[in-house]
Each structure stands twice: as C-alpha cells, then as structure tokens.
C-alpha cells in the first residue's frame, strides 16, 4: 500500500535571468527511493537522479540545469519560456511511483520576489 505523500514547493515565481530551486520531498513512507525523474511542462525530460548512478542531466539542459539541492533541481538563466508545470516522479521500492507538480512563473518585473513554500498537491 502506498502510504507516502509528495510535498512540493507548489506555485513559485522567479525573475527572468535568475535561478530557482525545484524541490519535492517524499514523506510518510519508509520506501526506498530508487530514482527521481524531473520533467518539464512541454514533456522534455530534464534530469534523472538514480540512487546508484547519481545524476544524469540531459545534454539539452546541461548549461542551465544544476543537480540539487538533495533530490531537487536548480534552474538557471531563466527565460519566459520556462514558465509552466514541472513534475517530479519518485520511483520507490516497494511502494511504486509517486508524482509531484510544481508550477513556475517567470516574471519580467525586477520586483518579482522568489516565493516558495512546501505544499501537498
């Protein structure tokens, strides 16, 4: 039985040209995390974090995506096109798969504040 929950940073905003941390956290389960997949709103695969092999950042994003902190992902040099949904998929044993959603809004305004709080979707 899947008892865990994914907590995410929910809806966040960040300035164009800046950076943002996408973070998911799996709680309420003792399941072993074997892999975390990060996917972008246009269905591009950004990165995979395999428990044995470590991080694999897809070459198309290597110049703008940094692994971490933890199982999260840091997006750098943000553009307006980065606005949209991001998904973390936790592969666990023995529970199975958990999925979390984050919505990122990239703002032109220089007064945009980086806002983030953990949410349960």
């Amino acid at each position: 039985m899947m008892t865990g929950t994914i907590e995410t940073t929910g809806n966040i905003s960040a300035k164009k040209g800046g950076s943002v941390i996408l973070q998911c956290h799996l709680s309420s389960t003792m399941a072993q995390v074997t892999q975390v997949n990060w996917e972008q709103h246009d269905h591009s695969l950004l990165a995979i974090r395999n428990a044995e092999l470590g991080w694999h950042i897809y070459p198309a994003f290597k110049d703008r995506v940094a692994p971490g902190p933890g199982l999260g992902l840091t997006l750098q040099s943000l553009t307006m096109n980065d606005t949209g949904e991001y998904f973390c998929t936790y592969h666990t044993y023995p529970d199975g798969t958990y999925r979390g959603r984050i919505f990122l809004e990239v703002l032109e305004s220089s007064v945009a504040e980086h806002s983030a709080r953990f949410q349960i979707p």
């Epitope: 074997t34 695969l45 092999l53 070459p59 198309a60 994003f61 592969h91 044993y93």
Partner: antibody
Framework: QLQLQESGPGLVKPSETLSLTCTVS??????????WGWIRQPPGKGLEWIGS???????YYNPSLKSRVTISVDTSKNQFSLKLSSVTAADTAVYYC?????????????WGQGTLVTVSS | EIVLTQSPATLSLSPGERATLSCRAS??????LAWYQQKPGQAPRLLIY???NRATGIPARFSGSGSGTDFTLTISSLEPEDFAVYYC????????FGGGTKVEIK
Amino acid sequence: QLQLQESGPGLVKPSETLSLTCTVSGGSISSSSYYWGWIRQPPGKGLEWIGSIYYSGSTYYNPSLKSRVTISVDTSKNQFSLKLSSVTAADTAVYYCARDPLYQDAPFDYWGQGTLVTVSS
Amino acid sequence: EIVLTQSPATLSLSPGERATLSCRASQSVSSYLAWYQQKPGQAPRLLIYDASNRATGIPARFSGSGSGTDFTLTISSLEPEDFAVYYCQQRANFPTFGGGTKVEIK
C-alpha cells in the same frame, strides 16, 4: 557477446494489452550503468523509443506513450518486459528491445532481432 | 520533443558512388547524434555515435560530421551491401529518431 531476444504474442486484439518479454544472454541485466529499452517500428515507417528500465525497476518513458506503458524487470530471469494497454491498429509494429546506455549519453548499442505484433480483431 | 528531419527520403545511386545523407534537428543536440543502418527484416545496426565516431567494426567508408542542428552521414564509395535505410537518432533529450533515408540502387 551480448544478445537480446524478444518474445510474446504476435496478435493482440484492439483495446487489449500488448505484452512482450526481452531475455538478455551473454551478460547480466544487473550490470551497473545500463538501462534496457523498448523501441518500435510500424511497418514501412520509422523508429520510436517507448521507454527504458534500470535493473532496480526505475523507468523513464516516452512522454507521448507513458500513460499506456509499463516496463518491468525480473533480474532472476535476466528479463525485462513491456506492457502497452488499450492498443489500437496504430500500435501494430515490430517491437525491439535494446541496451540503453543512458548515463553515457550514448545510443542504443545492442538490439534484439525484433518481433512483429499485429493489432487486429 | 526534439524532431529530426532526414533528407532526402530516397537516394538513388550506383555502387562506387558517394552518398551524402542529411539529418537536421529542431534544436541543438550538440554532438549527441547517432546513425544506424537497417536492412529489410533486420534490426538497426549502430554505425556512428557522437556525430563522428565509428562504432566497432564499421568500415572506414562510413563517416559522420556536424554539430548543433545539422549533421551528415557520408558513404565514400557505396558497396552493394550498403543499400539500406539509414536513421539518425539524438540523445540530447529523450531519444528520438529521424524518418529515415533509403539508399537504393540506381
């Protein structure tokens, strides 16, 4: 020499689930750093990657197919399997299994000979 | 999704001639591009990886070039066994393949 061999029914009815198995010989499916993938080719058409799995059971899928795809692994038999649900005539194809060196950013280097699956009532 | 467009769809040549096949990506794939050869009833065979490196056992008449969005596979002098369909594949994001170029005997 690494060899891969696909097996499974050659005929599946529309709306049912296609199930195939790939048996790996000449090497261990548990060998570190390799994923194992499925690729298909409709008659007279091009190639389409379906998804891949690590021996731990962690997967990554083609976003356009992932709602219908499940890939699993049985390390004790040195096998991995594909299930594709709710099939239609458009899923008629030769299905190949292959070794996927994801973490080397490398192409599929070893392939099975392929098995034709026809979707028809 | 990174879309790969191959041209021409068909190339009609004679043995001994030079074949030049093109693959264009919808966005940069750097050098993460491979070429495969496929003959009827067979699985694809890896020819070139990382845009220009020949796979093990591939004859020197096969060469690859390009980076970014434009890539070329060249067969310097066609042998009878080279008449087949050729596919490019990118690895910069989740794997996608081009539509293929058929090299046929003229």
